[in-house]
Amino acid sequence: HPSPAPPDQLNTSSAESELWEPGERLPVRLTNGSSSCSGTVEVRLEASWEPACGALWDSRAAEAVCRALGCGGAEAASQLAPPTPELPPPPAAGNTSVAANATLAGAPALLCSGAEWRLCEVVEHACRSDGRRARVTCAENRALRLVDGGGACAGRVEMLEHGEWGSVCDDTWDLEDAHVVCRQLGCGWAVQALPGLHFTPGRGPIHRDQVNCSGAEAYLWDCPGLPGQHYCGHKEDAGAVCSEHQSWRLTGGADRCEGQVEVHFRGVWNTVCDSEWYPSEAKVLCQSLGCGTAVERPKGLPHSLSGRMYYSCNGEELTLSNCSWRFNNSNLCSQSLAARVLCSASRSLHNLSTPEVPASVQTVTIESSVTVKIENKESRELMLL
């Protein structure tokens, strides 16, 4: 099948609430519950999560939240008593206004005109913030994830069913199937649908075989298919790489640990804008590539690729995608050069024939932008044909 056409996209970042990424459903989560599919409803407002107002919580919103989280329908929607005493009654006529403080500290509500997440809206300051909180218990504890691909948007496909994480067999696995996975996870669209052994094999049960999505399904478990049963082994675990997955390489240097910083994102390689490229960003990149630590940030050259990516790290992140990042889709880096870095494991520093790479878990970026982890002491080069 041809790859689904990427949707037109606006500028995006790692901490955005107004513009939802392709495939992202609702900026909601459930906390303090018995599973990821029950608990107090919280909505994302800019950089923080706030409890959703219980006074305006209804069955439509509960149904939409459960569906958006891949948890089936809603089994029970309720309100949690507030942590503080109940609200006072409306003020008697003639009393001084008490709105000043309560108004500004209003709680957000999730308002839905139907039971589908597309019909929902987060409305800020919709309720008195010391009122009841929305709670929901969803019917199914189902979930989906991508594992061992160097980020949440690439890796081996795993489904949670009956309390157990398991794989999906790669028989008939194609871009339409991967597209459903990517969209469900808020990871954009599918760049690659990968057969077994591109990522480390799974260990649990194999939940699905002969998956045959049209590409329009909201959840992977809505796609036609067979139970995993006995016909597949973990050498046939399906994988996916989504457009929102980021992988990195250094080019134009003495080896893979030195050069111009390039990120594969949304199907193309991009240079990184050096206007926000500091030691903390360089350190995270060198470490994530298994190249030691950053030694210097050589002066950049003009962008040889479209330069649209900015990163801001504190230096403790595992990869650059864990940092705050910004992808400017409409403008190239203004008045900046392409970021470069020299890592401590580069042979241009050590005059070694091969760079020193940590032996435990090595992150390898391979052609076509798939990032995998190889858990042995030998360095192996993987190529996708």
Epitope: S97, A99, A126
Partner: nanobody, 123 residues
């Protein structure tokens, strides 16, 4: 007791505009979230639009989004509903509502109702 009095209803042609007002007797007007509901002949009462205490947050029914605008003037104790591109299906009695605890999107949170003003859209 908050008294809500609607005005501005009337007969208008399809595609036309009307502005409804709702004045409140209550001096603590700004303590209430406000909204509009409507009831067409033979139909159930339905939510139209709501606005929070300070007017910073609004919410609309899908059927009126992009055509109706809710606003409030706390200094005048008045709520407004600007209705543009009116359609025959907008014909209804429009009720002003006030709520203390939450924006009046669902009927169970509403503390006070006005008596209503009739809007008729017909050629």
């Amino acid at each position: 007791q908050v008294q809500l009095v609607e005005s501005g209803g009337g007969l208008v042609q399809p595609g036309g505009s009307l502005r409804l007002s709702c004045s409140a007797s209550e001096r603590t007007f700004s303590d209430y979230a406000l909204g509009w509901f409507r009831q067409a002949p033979g139909k159930e009462r339905e939510f139209v639009a709501a606005i929070n205490w300070v007017g910073g947050s609004t919410y609309y029914a899908d059927s009126v989004k992009g055509r109706f605008t809710i606003s409030r003037d706390n200094s005048k104790n008045t709520l407004y509903l600007q209705m543009n591109s009116l359609r025959a299906e907008d014909t209804a009695v429009y009720y002003c509502v006030a709520s203390w605890g939450a924006m009046p999107v669902l009927t169970h949170v509403i503390n006070y109702w006005g008596k209503g003003t009739l809007v008729t859209v017909s050629s």
